[in-house]
């Protein structure tokens, strides 16, 4: 995870002035996945390459956020661009962040994990237990390494949360899961909440 | 009850390359990991690789980056194991291994010895 | 990577003993430690995992303890069937790794 946007990023630096106006224009027509939401229009518009990069990982997340770029610049004519955005798809295509699953737009839903970012981030203590129930499955090696660098729990909890706008639904899942096991009480005392 | 039944012996050539397989049942195949090991004869064991089989991801030691590629077929629970450009030196037996939680090993399968001689 | 030692490659035990066998991490390995036995005929069980957790369907005559980098698997009423050889791995880093093993045998 990471590298996505990354690629997303670099093609869209990429792009002259015009081809960017004309790849926004572009993305608010495009046909979108079910469960999907577009970005609108006023705020779109007004974005520089980084800006657009961040909002189409937040709304539609690395894996489908790339496959909509690729899309979009295939009917822009950009063939080379899409390519290698392409390859990216192909080579990072592992991690459970890069399964298809439809984000159910967590903005609107709001998942346990957004709602209460910051009082898991004050409360859990018992990080590593969180980490071994993510690896592999949801966080990568490298991702696991970092998180467990972190000196303090807060550190570590907000290092594991700077990966989660890359995550889909059933990643988000999986923290809450791993937290029910680990923080039962923690849990239930934010449910209430 | 889980159980990891790993395919019979390999009489290869040097240069060759093997797949050998892992065929995993009792559990969900997908929820867990399954790692490979390696251990020439009278000697300690050598951890190769592992795959996460609900996602593909899989993480090699750099030892064996390019001798061993780890799939996974989850229509039949089967893990695979292939080595490439064979030597002596990959004579050995393999074991495949389930991953638990703290990635121990919990469940280990009986092993396939690959012998490679011309 | 880090290196797992076990000091002591073979150990002979009379029948009732307590056995200690040891494992030494090259740095800390905060608990991620593991215990294999390997029988004679090859199969491998997982004993202790993460330090002292023991493994379900285990005899409670094998325990283990240690933290940083020392750790330690003991039988504390060593039995014929325990004739093996033990084996200890790290999973806390990449390459993950196992000890040269430790040969039990009865005196």
């Known amino acids: 995870m990471g590298r996505a946007r990354d690629a997303i990023l670099d093609a869209l630096e990429n792009l002259s002035g015009d081809e960017l106006k004309k790849f926004k224009m572009k993305l608010l027509t495009v046909q979108l996945r079910e469960g999907y939401g577009r970005i609108p229009r006023g705020a779109l518009l007004q974005m520089d390459a980084i800006d657009l990069t961040d909002k189409l990982v937040s709304y539609y997340l690395e894996s489908y956020g790339l496959e909509l770029t690729m899309t979009v610049l295939r009917d822009m004519g950009l063939q080379e661009l899409a390519e290698q955005l392409q390859t990216t798809k192909e080579e990072s295509g592992a991690v459970a962040a890069a399964a298809s699953v439809p984000a159910q737009s967590t903005a609107r839903t709001g998942h346990f994990v957004d709602q209460h970012r910051q009082a898991l981030i004050a409360r859990v203590t018992e990080v590593d237990g969180v980490l071994d129930a993510l690896h592999g499955s949801v966080l990568t090696e490298g991702q696991y390494q970092a998180v467990r660098a972190e000196t303090t729990s807060q550190d570590k909890m907000r290092k594991l949360f700077s990966f989660v706008p890359s995550w889909n639904l059933t990643c988000k899942d999986s923290l809450l899961q791993a937290l029910k096991e680990i923080h039962p009480y923690l849990v239930m005392d934010l449910e209430q909440s | 009850e889980v159980q990891l039944q790993q395919s019979g012996a390999e009489l290869v050539r040097p240069g060759s390359s093997v797949k050998m397989s892992c065929e995993t049942s009792g559990y969900t195949f997908t929820t867990y990991g399954l790692t490979w090991v390696k251990q020439r004869p009278g000697q300690g064991l050598e951890w190769i690789g592992y795959?996460?089989?609900?996602?593909?991801?899989?993480e090699y030691n750099e030892k064996f980056k390019d001798k061993a590629t780890l799939t996974s077929d989850t229509s039949s629970s089967i893990v695979y194991m292939q080595l490439s450009s064979l030597t002596s030196e990959d004579s050995a037996i393999y074991f495949c291994?389930?991953?638990?939680?703290?990635?121990?090993?919990?469940?280990w399968g009986q092993g396939t010895t690959l012998t490679v001689s011309s | 990577a880090i290196q797992m030692t076990q000091t002591t490659s073979s150990l002979s035990a009379s029948l009732g003993d307590r056995v200690t066998i040891s494992c030494r991490a090259s740095q800390d390995i905060s608990n991620y430690l593991h215990w294999y036995q390997q029988k004679p005929d090859g199969t491998v069980k997982l004993l202790i995992f993460?330090?002292?957790g023991l493994r379900s369907g285990v005899p409670s005559r094998f325990s283990g303890s240690g933290s940083g980098t020392d750790y330690s698997l003991t039988i504390s009423n060593l039995e014929q069937e325990d004739i093996a050889t033990y084996f200890c791995?790290?999973?806390?880093?990449?390459?993950?790794?196992f000890g040269g093993g430790t040969k039990l045998e009865i005196k």
């Open positions: 791995q790290q999973s806390i880093l990449l390459p993950w790794t």
């Open positions: 291994a389930r991953l638990g939680l703290r990635r121990h090993f919990d469940y």
């Open positions: 795959i996460y089989v609900g996602n593909g991801y899989t």
């Open positions: 993460f330090t002292s």
